[in-house]
């Protein structure tokens, strides 16, 4: 990119550059028309018979350098061939010299700085590539010369350009003073500012475009070369912020349209809102959940919105004394999530009718909550109590929902309490064919013991056919018809109005081989 400091082709008024010395044959300003018939200014000089050592100087106005370190001067000029000038002496030249002088303000006058090399800095002696020939009475013919010179390095606020003629017949048709700069550039969503190169290459820090954020890694930079071109090199750039996507050839970040979102910064485009969510504004990084739908804290921002599950279905209960096995079917609606668990709430009602949350004597296997499988075993139920179990299904967003959690209830009433197991069986008398047994009366909570059932079988004789039962209303019994010298396993259970209690522990007893021995053994 070129930034013009001076272009005589664009000047509409007299240039009025300074000439030195004030003598005849000096540079003179002319006006004319360029190829587009626009008014332009030129300078001519043609003192081919000048005195030796006499130079004609022409100096531009003061040109602020505007931060440029190197300035380029493009000269368009024509040069008359010395041979075609009848009056030309040996002092006729076909070259001219270009100088510049730096200053911090427009301080030059008609006489200062001194019109010579040092203080003026010589740029170059310019020779014409194309010479114009002039025939008497005919128009001069010849090509225009174009020469670009480089001035600098410059350090002061501005400068003057000066032309020294020492015997040429020439016309300075135009002067274009400019400097080169790297144009503002946007690449990879990174904007690099317009930069005037101060050296061969200058590193330039980039900044992210609006709605973009720096990518990880070193901050983006690009090199501006002295020729005003950006050096080609990969740019670790920026990426569009959440809610924005790259557009217009990676030069802009465009807000996600309504109904779309982009959750993270980086590459990628806006996506339609996931299930059960919406975005009513542009530039959404996340879509809002519909009423009744939620995202768990651990859900990604781009995850669909989900809802708590419906209640479990078809709870089936199997009561076994003080134990209860509950199982159920999964809810019809999972809420769109995989992390389904179950939990139980429990209330117990006493026989008298007062109800309260279940006490700590109940145990749940595997537990009362966070159940992954649709079943539980409840132990420690108290007899003659009514239990209400509410089975709820939960998922990762249940805690976010307001309002009651749907549940499936089941009511279970336990039987009244049966007598406890009979233990401490004693053998009171033993013979080769019989055993007399006694035991302590168990404390039955729901009324007296009505009777007992004795269950026995010979040790080693397993199977239902070998088991015998005996009922007795007393807390003793005599087992007859037993084998001599045999071992027997005996269990006793008590019956009350609530029914039979459990059999006690098996008691090991043995019949006698003969009468006298048996009595001794038992007494011992």
């Amino acid at each position: 990119l070129e930034e013009t400091l001076l272009n005589t082709k664009l000047e509409t008024a007299d240039l009025k550059w300074v000439t030195f010395p004030q003598v005849d044959g000096q540079w003179e300003e002319l006006s004319g028309l360029d190829e587009e018939q626009h008014s332009v200014r030129t300078y001519e000089v043609c003192d081919v018979q000048r005195a030796p050592g006499q130079a004609h100087w022409l100096r531009t106005g003061w040109v602020p350098r505007r931060g440029a370190v190197h300035v380029y001067a493009t000269l368009r000029f024509t040069m008359l061939e010395c041979l075609s000038l009848p009056r030309a002496g040996r002092s006729c030249k076909e070259t001219f010299t270009v100088f510049y002088y730096e200053s911090d303000a427009d301080t030059a006058t008609a006489l200062t700085p001194a019109w010579m090399e040092n203080p003026y800095i010589k740029v170059d002696t310019v020779a014409a590539e194309h010479l114009t020939r002039k025939r008497p009475g005919a128009e001069a013919t010849g090509k225009v010369n174009v020469k670009t010179l480089r001035l600098g390095p410059l350090s002061k606020a501005g400068f003057y350009l000066a032309f020294q003629d020492q015997g040429a017949c020439m016309a300075l048709l135009s002067l274009h003073l400019f400097y080169k700069k790297c144009a503002q550039l946007t690449v990879n969503l990174t904007r690099f500012p317009e930069t005037v190169p101060r050296e061969l290459v200058v590193p330039v820090a980039g900044s992210c475009v609006v709605d973009a954020v720096p990518a990880p890694g070193p901050s983006p930079s690009l090199y501006c070369r002295e020729d005003g071109q950006w050096a080609e090199q990969p740019v670790t750039g920026c990426s569009c912020a959440p809610g924005f996507e790259a557009a217009e050839g990676n030069t802009k970040c465009r807000a996600c349209a309504q109904g779309t979102f982009k959750p993270l910064s980086g590459e990628g485009s806006c996506q339609p809102c996931p299930a059960n969510s919406h975005s009513n504004t542009i530039g959404s990084a996340v879509c809002q959940c519909r009423v009744g739908y939620f995202r768990a804290r651990t859900d990604p921002r781009g995850a669909p919105c989900t809802t708590p599950p419906s209640a479990p279905r078809s709870v089936v209960s199997r009561l076994n004394g003080s134990s209860l096995h509950l199982e159920w079917s999964a809810p019809l609606e999972s809420g769109g999530r995989e992390d389904l668990t179950y939990a139980l709430r429990c209330r117990e009602c006493r026989p008298g009718g007062s109800c309260a949350p279940c006490g700590g004597d109940l145990t749940f296997d595997p537990g009362p909550r966070d159940l992954v499988e649709p079943w539980v075993v409840v132990r420690g139920l108290r007899p003659d109590f009514t239990y209400t179990f509410e089975v709820t299904a939960l998922n990762g967003v249940s805690s976010l929902a307001t309002g009651p959690v749907p549940f499936e209830p089941v009511n279970v009433t336990t039987d009244r309490e049966v007598p406890p197991a009979v233990s401490d069986i004693r053998v009171t008398r033993s013979s080769p064919s019989s055993l007399s047994l006694a035991w302590a009366v168990p404390r039955a909570p729901s009324g007296a013991v009505l009777d007992y059932e004795v269950k026995y079988h010979e040790k080693g004789a397993e199977g239902p056919s070998s088991v015998r039962f005996l009922k007795t209303s007393e807390n003793r019994a005599e087992l007859r018809g037993l084998k001599r010298g045999a071992s027997y396993l005996v269990q006793v259970r008590a019956r009350s109005e609530a029914g039979y209690g459990p059999f006690g522990q098996e008691h090991h007893s043995q019949t006698q081989l003969d009468e006298s021995e048996g009595w001794r053994e038992q007494l011992a």
Epitope: T12, A13, D14, K16, Q22, E28, E29, L30, S31, G32, L33, Q37, S39, T42, E44, C46, T78, L80, T132, K134, G137, E139, A140, C169, A171
Partner: antibody, heavy 126, light 108 residues
Framework: QVQLVESGGGLVQPGGSLRLSCAAS????????MSWVRQAPGKGLEWVSN????????HYADSVKGRFTISRDNSKNTLYLQMNSLRAEDTAVYYC???????????????????WGQGTLVTVSS | DIELTQPPSVSVAPGQTARISCSGD??????VHWYQQKPGQAPVLVIY???KRPSGIPERFSGSNSGNTATLTISGTQAEDEADYYC???????????FGGGTKLTVL
């Protein structure tokens, strides 16, 4: 001898037309930009029109634009001013003038008039 | 376009210095040319490019231009210098030429 000689002036009625001529001699006419300048009786000088050496461009004062036409015939070394729709305020001495010439480039000219004719009187009256 | 203003008349005793001014906005940024016109004659260029003198013009004629004013100076004025003097400049961009109203110089 370097000179410019105007002719064609005279008395003309308002709305009438007149054509002035300016014969050039003693210099390379086809390299010169030429102009007409007029001077009303007892008044100052007023520039009227310019023409480039090759007739590629003409310029006019606002007061005559659309009514006057400047032209030249380089083969005859002659400059012309065709005046139509003449008005009383056009009454003046009309001078033909040469603009300062370039050494060798007829596309350019200096901004002063370095050679004048003796003038020709145009009277617009009924 | 630029407007050039001259005093209608200036008087000077023979041998004295006559100064004729020509003013206009930022005139110093333009080149000013001066013409002498004697009664019944065509104008003659006496100063061009602010201060240059054409060949044949006496050295007593000089010119300057800065700020808003250009000045034609005739030092050691002679009776033959009595004439009307006109300043002229180039109208920016349009190739239109602009003249001042003229100043009658009387040599007393």
């Amino acid at each position: 001898q370097v000179q410019l000689v105007e002719s064609g002036g005279g008395l003309v009625q308002p709305g009438g037309s007149l054509r002035l001529s300016c014969a050039a001699s003693g210099f390379t006419f086809n390299n010169a930009w030429m102009s007409w300048v007029r001077q009303a009786p007892g008044k100052g000088l007023e520039w009227v029109s310019n023409i480039t050496s090759s007739s590629s461009m003409t310029h006019y004062a606002d007061s005559v634009k659309g009514r006057f036409t400047i032209s030249r015939d380089n083969s005859k070394n002659t400059l012309y001013l065709q005046m139509n729709s003449l008005r009383a305020e056009d009454t003046a001495v009309y001078y033909c003038a040469r603009k300062g010439m370039s050494f060798y480039n007829n596309k350019y000219a200096k901004s002063m008039f370095d050679l004048w004719g003796q003038g020709t009187l145009v009277t617009v009256s009924s | 376009d630029i407007e050039l203003t001259q005093p209608p008349s200036v008087s000077v005793a023979p041998g004295q210095t006559a100064r004729i001014s020509c003013s206009g906005d930022n005139l110093g940024k333009k080149y000013v040319h001066w013409y002498q016109q004697k009664p019944g004659q065509a104008p003659v260029l006496v100063i061009y490019y602010d201060s240059k003198r054409p060949s044949g013009i006496p050295e007593r004629f000089s010119g300057s231009n800065s700020g808003n004013t250009a000045t034609l100076t005739i030092s050691g004025t002679q009776a033959e210098d009595e004439a009307d003097y006109y300043c002229q400049a180039w109208g920016a961009g349009s190739h239109q030429m602009v003249f001042g109203g003229g100043t009658k110089l009387t040599v007393l």
